[in-house]
């Protein structure tokens, strides 16, 4: 797809004798406008044949009134370019017709009085994307100076606007079978759609490169009407192209709009209203497909079953959006309780808990003794950022619920033997040691390194650990 642009530079009397009379007068002021008609290839320029590549109409020029006795000057021109959008490939060779029309502004009855002032035609070779080409054409005593060019509309590129380029989805490569688009190396070539030259009104395609015809049309490019010989006795006046009074196929018959597009007839053609995700004359172009790699951040692309979506991205954890382009800010949901610091590591979420709290989401309160009972006579002690139970003899565990085996930790030193007792443990010390855990050696002279043993206990006696 692209746009043919025409810039009119001047329209006025040509060189040489026989200057034309001004088209406007004081009695009949007028203004000019231009019409351009484009046809592909080096076809005949007959005005009656359709403008298969398109046509455009300029704005009206300024009102002009001839000064009596003055020769016809270059006439005032409308502002701006004439633009003819083309939807398919630019053919390279084309025929043009440029018509100069006069709109009389006198007080005649009825509608605007339009008359054709001059018509020029020609055949040219032109590559899309090239510079402006200048031209001069003469029609009778009039001369028209103009420039023209063809340019591609993104995503199309190339001299025929047939290469479709789209921004690369992955940094290093294009999709399967698709090349980078020189000179736009950061873009990738996309596949072609219909066969070049396929009739925009009577043909359509569902696969790249094909041209399928609507009912009533045939030929490789759907430009040949099916014979009307099946009509029964023709009645009434007919033209060379109409042999009978059976209405021909309408442009929306058979619905040329693909992908759920709806067709409406326009005064001379048709128009497809495309669902979201599609564009093109027949909604045949998907804005993006899985081949374009539209899913970012490792998302999995699958073709959409819903006509409203050409593809669907299944996003990995931590990403969202139709293209998995948005990192999910999982911390924005404030998953860490009790003032914990949230860390989104991409593959996982972590909570760094404040002192006194624990758990995957800091949901456990460690240092609140209020309402927290320590079993079996234990008492709750706060401090150090963690709560704990000080358990009664014979009990242990976090909440003093476990019955303790006091000898399990081998508390008696120097080979002392441990005996479990209802109130705790008792160590029977080996010779030469004393103390509740047999931790003190007895001096060889019989004196102790410690003060005398409590009354009633001799060294060597079992010591009870209170």
């Amino acid at each position: 797809a692209g746009v043919f642009e025409l810039q009119i530079h001047s329209f006025g009397p040509g060189p040489g004798p026989g200057a034309p009379r001004s088209p406007c007068s004081a009695r009949l002021p007028c203004r000019l406008f231009f019409r351009v008609c484009l046809k592909p290839g080096l076809s005949e320029e007959a005005a009656e044949s359709p403008c298969a590549l398109g046509a455009a109409l300029s704005a009206r020029g300024p009102v002009y009134t001839e000064q009596p006795g003055a020769p016809a000057p270059d006439l005032p021109l409308p502002d701006g370019l004439l633009q003819v959008p083309f939807r398919d490939a630019w053919p390279g060779t084309f025929s043009f017709i440029i018509e100069t029309w006069r709109e009389e502004l006198g007080d005649q009855i009825g509608g605007p009085a339009w008359s054709l002032l001059a018509r020029v035609a020609g055949r040219r070779r032109l590559a899309a994307g090239g510079p402006w080409a200048r031209d001069i054409q003469r029609a009778g005593a009039w001369e028209l100076r103009f420039s023209y060019r063809a340019r591609c509309e993104p995503p199309a590129v190339g001299t025929a606007c047939t290469r479709l380029c789209r921004p690369r989805s992955a940094p290093s490569r294009c999709g399967p079978g698709l090349r980078p688009c020189a000179p736009l190396e950061d873009e990738c070539e996309a596949p072609l759609v219909c066969r070049a030259g396929c009739s925009p009104e009577h043909g359509f395609c569902e696969q790249p490169g094909e041209c399928r015809c609507l009912e009533g049309w045939t030929g490789p490019l759907c430009t040949v009407p099916v014979s009307t010989s099946s009509c029964l006795s023709p009645r009434g006046p007919s033209s060379a192209t109409t042999g009978c009074l059976v209405p021909g196929p309408g442009p929306c018959d058979g619905n040329p709009c693909a992908n759920g597009g709806s067709c409406s007839e326009t005064p001379r053609s048709f128009e497809c209203t495309c669902p979201r995700g599609f564009y093109g004359l027949r909604c045949e172009v998907s804005g993006v497909t899985c081949a374009d790699g539209p899913c970012f951040n490792g998302g999995l692309c699958v073709g959409g079953a819903d006509p409203d979506s050409a593809y669907i991205c299944h996003c990995p954890p931590g990403f969202q959006g139709s293209n998995c382009e948005k990192r999910v800010d999982r911390c924005s949901l404030q998953p860490c309780r009790n003032g914990g610091l949230c860390l989104d590591l991409g593959h996982a979420l972590r909570c760094r808990c404040r002192a006194g709290f624990a758990g995957p989401r800091c949901e456990h309160d460690l240092d609140d003794c209020a309402g927290r009972a320590c079993a079996n006579g234990g008492t709750c002690v706060e401090g150090g950022g963690a709560h704990r139970c000080s358990c009664a003899l014979g009990f242990g565990g976090r909440d003093c619920r476990e019955r303790a085996d006091p000898c399990a930790a081998r508390p008696c030193a120097h080979g002392g033997r441990c005996y479990a007792h209802f109130s705790g443990l008792v160590c029977a010390c080996a010779p030469g040691y004393m103390g509740a855990r047999c931790e003190f050696p007895v001096h060889p002279d019989g004196a102790s390194a410690l003060p005398a043993a409590p009354p009633g206990l001799r060294p060597g006696d079992p010591q009870r650990y209170l």
């Epitope: 406008f33 019409r35 008609c37 005005a47 009656e48 044949s49 359709p50 403008c51 398109g54 046509a55 455009a56 109409l57 003819v84 017709i97 018509e99 029309w101 009825g110 509608g111 605007p112 339009w114 054709l116 033209s239 192209t241 109409t242 209405p247 021909g248 409406s264 007839e265 326009t266 005064p267 001379r268 053609s269 128009e271």
Partner: antibody, heavy 124, light 106 residues
Framework: QITLKESGPTLVKPTQTLTLTCTFS??????????VGWIRQPPGKALEWLAH???????RYSPSLKSRLTITKDTSKNQVVLTMTNMDPVDTATYYC????????????????WGQGTLVTVSS | DIQMTQSPSSLSASVGDRVTITCSAS?????MYWYQQKPGKAPKLLIY???NLASGVPSRFSGSGSGTDFTLTISSLQPEDFATYYC?????????FGQGTKLEIK
Amino acid sequence: QITLKESGPTLVKPTQTLTLTCTFSGFSLSTSGMGVGWIRQPPGKALEWLAHIWWDDVKRYSPSLKSRLTITKDTSKNQVVLTMTNMDPVDTATYYCARIVSFDNDVVSAMDYWGQGTLVTVSS
Amino acid sequence: DIQMTQSPSSLSASVGDRVTITCSASSSVSHMYWYQQKPGKAPKLLIYLTSNLASGVPSRFSGSGSGTDFTLTISSLQPEDFATYYCQQWRSNPFTFGQGTKLEIK
């Protein structure tokens, strides 16, 4: 000077076919951009577009009447013919033909000249 | 189908008044066309391509708008302006007219 004039029967019976002819002068249907359309207006009601035909034989019909309408042109006679089958009393209306101009490929510039209209009554 | 809704359906005004008739399309159209019709006569083109004055139409008539909302304005009503006015779209088949606005003398 551009003129258009409708001709045809003023009275038709139900189920019959109506054939209307628009004869024009001052322009030609062989000229690029020219077309002729048909519009009708039931008594006391609004205008309703029926059909039109272009210089290159592109035709358009009102979808609600498409199965009953046919439009043709005879460029050499400067005539456009509209036929409407299976007439019904609700088709009673004044039928107008008008010139349509399209300088752009698919934009109507104006429907600028109209015929005086012909009243067609459908009654048994 | 694109429905064309004109408002008001009728209005009374005096010579010299400024009158505005609106036409609302049920979906977007590129251009609007306005016609004037007097009893027993064919419609006459007033405005084409939204804002262009047809030849022979006085400059007190003007057209404007875009998308779905369009306006016909008569800046200073004259006796010959009392008639019925119709808008029309050429965007999509059927090429519909509005129901008409009857402009009567007060």
